[in-house]
């Protein structure tokens, strides 16, 4: 009996520009002989319902229809028919199908590949056109994919050390699509510094599918009004 197993859950998520390995493992009751084996990988895009060949290997023929695509013949011997795609792009997301022949049997499996791009976040202070004691803090998130993103603002005071979400005076603009298919968005927080306690820590919190943990950028209100900090580093998909 010949069986093919793909990524558990049927979905693989990979970061933009990564060298991704799309898993496909062959299970067979006998030792595998590469001379009687073949592997073809197909791809179907999210937008266009047509399957195209990505890579094929059989007999004395091997071809990468997508530049750089490779299945290791040595790993194939041990049942690993995984496809390696260097420098994966957003438009390469979709359904990948691994079709395996171990003479005279045939088996196949499919997996959805999601390509994500993590946002970069930075805080800016905009005082142009603002009244005295009034500041506008901008949290810019850029280069993310997919479009869905959640930006919130939180504050911590010495009285209330647990973060409190700020809902007033927050305006989040529309997402803007970049030439490369990624998105940008800016969220603004308007603050009246005369009404806030010095030492209050404000955070812009960005949540996105590409992030294991939210991306947090903070600033502290001082007597001198403000002090912007570096964006805290977070673990992204690797």
């Amino acid at each position: 009996d010949l069986k093919v197993e793909m990524m558990a859950g049927g979905t693989q998520i990979t970061p933009l520009n990564d060298n991704v390995t799309i898993f496909c493992n062959i299970f067979y009751s006998q030792p595998l002989n590469i001379t009687s084996m073949g592997i073809t990988w197909f791809w179907k895009s999210l937008t266009f319902d047509k399957e195209v060949k990505v890579f094929e290997f059989f007999g004395d023929h091997q071809e990468a229809f997508r530049p750089g695509a490779i299945v290791s013949p040595w790993r194939l011997k041990s049942g690993d028919a995984s496809l390696r795609l260097p420098g994966i792009q957003l438009e390469e997301a979709g359904e990948y199908r691994c079709e395996v022949v171990v003479t005279p049997l045939k088996a196949q499996g499919t997996v959805q590949l999601e390509v994500v791009a993590s946002p970069a976040s930075r805080l800016l202070l905009d005082q142009v056109g603002m009244k005295e004691n009034e500041d506008k803090y901008m949290c810019e998130s850029s280069g993310f994919y997919p479009e869905a993103i959640n930006i919130t603002w939180e504050k911590q005071t010495q009285k209330f050390p647990h973060p409190i979400e700020i809902s007033e005076d927050v305006i989040t603009g529309p997402t803007i699509k970049n030439m490369d298919g990624t998105f940008n968005v800016t969220s603004c927080l308007k603050l009246n510094s005369s009404q806030e306690d010095p030492g209050t820590v404000y955070q812009c919190v960005v949540r996105h599918a590409s992030l294991h943990t939210p991306l947090r950028s903070n600033f502290t209100l001082t007597a001198a009004r403000h002090s912007l900090s570096e964006t805290e580093k977070t673990d992204n998909f690797s």
């Epitope: 001379t35 009687s36 073949g38 073809t40 004395d60 071809e63 022949v101 003479t103 005279p104």
Partner: antibody, heavy 117, light 107 residues
């Protein structure tokens, strides 16, 4: 649905070059290998060669010294040039798409090329 | 080159019959074999690929089997439109080679 159409002169003089073009519609030429196959009248099929890009091709060793294949992705066409033809090259010439596992899953209707002075 | 030998070279049969055509490779070709049907004045049509997989749109009365060197194309319940010449083709190595053909004629 993919459609293949061969075109070229039906009559070629001995020692000259046979030139055929296959125009592909309904599919991208850059997604497949493409073959040329010929069939002399009342005989079997002979594989001439296949091409993916101009650098990636395979020719039948029996014809290799006389064959040049090329691809024009902008026109979605591929071509066959067979030089120094003789009467033995008289045949119906087919272009075909190489589908899964080396099979030819789409064919042109074929064009008869006669080599005669 | 791998030689592909088909037998018989021709077969006479009636509508409803079961017809078997064999194809033998001069060396092992694993499962890398295709079968085609050709009618007079027409281009060949793919029936079976990778020895036993039925091409989309091909009636299920056509079936293929075999691996290594010996392969079979079976037409069960022969229909009037099945009278044609059938070719096998190996895709294991270059150059690709075809069998000499088997003509299925009306008895």
């Amino acid at each position: 649905q993919v459609h293949l159409q061969e075109s070229g002169p039906g009559l070629v003089k001995p020692s000259e070059t046979l030139s055929l073009t296959c125009t592909v519609s309904g599919d991208s030429i850059s997604s497949y290998y493409w073959s040329w196959i010929r069939q002399p009248a009342g005989k079997g099929l002979e594989w001439i060669g296949h091409i993916y890009t101009s650098e990636k091709n395979n020719y039948n060793p029996s014809l290799k010294s006389r064959v040049i294949m090329s691809v024009d992705t902008s026109k979605n066409q591929f071509s066959l040039n067979l030089s120094s033809v003789t009467a033995a090259d008289t045949a119906v010439y087919y272009c075909a798409r190489v589908g899964n596992w080396g099979s030819h899953d789409a064919w042109g209707q074929g064009t008869l090329v006669t080599v005669s002075s | 080159d791998i030689q592909m030998t088909q037998s018989p070279s021709s077969v006479s049969a009636s509508v409803g019959d079961r017809v078997t055509i064999t194809c033998r490779a001069s060396q092992g070709i694993s499962s890398w074999l295709a079968w085609y049907q050709q009618k007079p004045g027409k281009a060949p049509k793919l029936l079976i690929y990778v020895a036993s997989s039925l091409q989309r749109g091909v009636p299920s009365r056509f079936s293929g089997s075999g691996s290594g060197t010996d392969f079979t194309l079976t037409i069960s319940n022969l229909q009037p439109e099945d009278f044609a010449t059938y070719y096998c083709q190996q895709a294991n190595s270059f150059p690709r080679t075809f069998g000499q053909g088997t003509k299925v004629e009306i008895k």
